[in-house]
């Protein structure tokens, strides 16, 4: 019960991580003109991943997309690779861990097929996460480096050449919102990773194993872990998990844990 | 096509308050825009004092802050301006205003002359 | 608070000739987030209010004749009427859209000659 609720709420969290991601990506507001002392402005700018719009006090908002793709900064492209990455292995971890739910049956697929999979999708939540931390970390380092060296600029117009106090940027909703959900992402990840040890079948690794020495029919049983497992001398044709789940290994051994001596 | 109508009292004493409304018609004040006001006195410029959104937000000329209210009543289609402790130099011609793209005026009352004199 | 400069007080041109008055703010009014300058241009007639003629420092007001255009960037600009009708005759006034408070110019009177 504890290991389906483990996995379900694991699920959860990274749907809601992923799709944070996702929302995140696709916002505008990536860094934000700064307000410092001036908390009430008649053009407010503000940037994304993929354009970078201007709010108007009359109300009015356009955005222009990038549309070059060489002439951008390496860092933002870099940024945009690490949140796509993200996405793409978020996704492909939901679509992996619907199947590896405890509580939705397909076919006759083995307990051990779901420990599996289910451990695949926790690593690929893991690793969206991961991505979309590094690449919202990675933006955000890149305004701190450049708040302050937004000094005093030269543009070129159609006067000539102007002086002009380059507009200052700090960290925009969108920062917060992809550190909160790869932090969700990573969390849905390692819930599901510890599911999957509750799925997987241990006694695989600690199956009985015979020496029959000579002149002697006794059965040897390593009892080395037993404060860990629970297995002991009187644990023989015991089954440890409800789910009666067996793992790939442990139908190919030939002779199973129901081995008697 | 957005009309703008102030009205007020043309003549008011020093020292006292200055009340002006702008009545919106051929549209709804509360479209989203700013509802600005600016006043002109007598052979001068142009001087913003300030503006209100339908929300109840508000921005104003810092040299007018202290002595400027600007509110609004979205039921009546209006919103007012009040000008504290006035003097000889706040006689102008005050204009109410809508703004639009580039932060430009392109909507403006027939404007109302206010003199202050006592 | 930007101050805005206009140039000549007054102008005066003969009809079908061309009338170009100059503005300067004492900051740049050219926003790098949409490479746009914040100079608004208007028209005002005796007893009239304003009437918007260039917003964007280059950008016609619809209904505004193609005679009259905008141009510069930055902390200088230009209205240039190309051909001076009867009915220009008016103060013209600058404004900066940029920041607040919003100011205008001290406005040039253009007359005929």
């Known amino acids: 019960m504890a290991v389906t609720a483990c996995q379900g709420l694991g699920f959860v969290v990274s749907l809601i991580g992923i799709a944070g991601i996702i929302a995140a990506t696709c916002m505008d507001q990536w860094s934000t003109q700064d307000l410092y002392n001036n908390p009430v402005t008649a053009v407010f700018n503000y940037q994304g991943l993929w354009r970078s719009c201007v709010r108007e006090s009359s109300g009015f908002t356009e955005c222009r997309g990038y549309f070059t793709l060489l002439g951008l900064p390496a860092m933002l492209q870099a940024v945009r690779a690490l949140m796509i990455v993200g996405i793409v292995l978020g996704a492909i971890g939901l679509l992996v861990s619907i199947f590896a739910l405890k509580c939705i049956r397909i076919g006759s697929m083995e307990d051990s097929a779901k420990a599996n999979m289910t451990l695949t999708s926790g690593i690929m939540f893991i690793v969206s996460g991961l991505c979309a931390i590094a690449g919202v970390s990675v933006f955000a380092n890149m305004l701190v480096t450049n708040f302050w060296m937004s000094t005093a600029n030269m543009y070129t117009g159609m006067g000539g050449m102007v002086q002009t106090v380059q507009t200052r940027y700090t960290f925009g909703a969108a920062l917060f919102v992809g550190w909160v959900a790869g932090g969700l992402t990573l969390i849905g990840g390692v819930m599901m990773c510890i599911a999957c040890r509750g799925l997987a079948p241990e006694e695989t690794n600690y199956k009985a194993v015979s020496y029959h020495a000579s002149g002697h029919s006794v059965a040897y049983k390593p009892g080395g872990f037993k404060a860990s497992t629970g297995f002991g001398s009187n644990t023989k044709n015991k089954k440890i998990y409800d789910g009666g789940a067996r793992t790939e290994d442990e139908v190919q051994s030939y002779p199973s844990k129901h081995d008697y001596v | 096509q957005v009309q703008l109508q102030e009205s007020g009292p043309g003549l008011v004493k020093p020292s006292q308050t200055l009340s002006l409304t702008c009545t919106v018609s051929?549209?709804?004040?509360?479209?989203?825009?700013?509802w600005h006001w600016i006043r002109q006195p007598p052979g001068k410029g142009l001087e913003w004092i300030g503006y209100?959104?339908?929300?109840?937000?508000?921005n104003y000329n810092p040299a007018l802050r202290s002595r400027v209210t600007i509110s609004v009543d979205t039921s009546k289609n209006q919103f007012s301006l009040k000008l504290s402790s006035v003097t000889a130099a706040d006689t102008a011609v005050y204009y109410c205003?809508?703004?639009?793209?580039?932060?430009?005026?392109?909507?403006w009352g027939q404007g109302t002359t206010v003199t202050v004199s006592s | 608070d930007i101050v805005m400069t206009q140039s000549p007080d007054s102008l005066a041109v003969s009809l079908g000739e061309r009338a170009t008055i100059n503005c300067k703010s004492s900051?740049?009014?050219?926003?790098?987030?949409?490479?746009?300058?914040?100079l608004t241009w208007y028209q005002q007639k005796p007893g009239q209010p304003p009437k918007l003629l260039i917003y964007?420092?280059?950008t016609r007001e619809s209904g505004v004749p193609d005679r009259f255009s905008g141009s510069g960037s930055g902390t200088d600009f230009t209205l240039t009427i190309s051909s001076l009708q009867a009915e220009d005759v008016a103060v013209y006034y600058c404004q900066n859209a940029y920041s607040f408070p919003y100011t205008f110019g001290g406005g040039t009177k253009l007359e005929i000659k």
């Open positions: 209100i959104h339908y929300t109840g937000s508000t």
């Open positions: 051929g549209g709804s004040i509360s479209s989203g825009y700013n």
């Open positions: 964007w420092a280059s």
């Open positions: 900051q740049s009014l050219f926003n790098s987030g949409n490479q746009k300058n914040y």
């Open positions: 205003a809508r703004i639009y793209n580039g932060n430009s005026f392109p909507y």
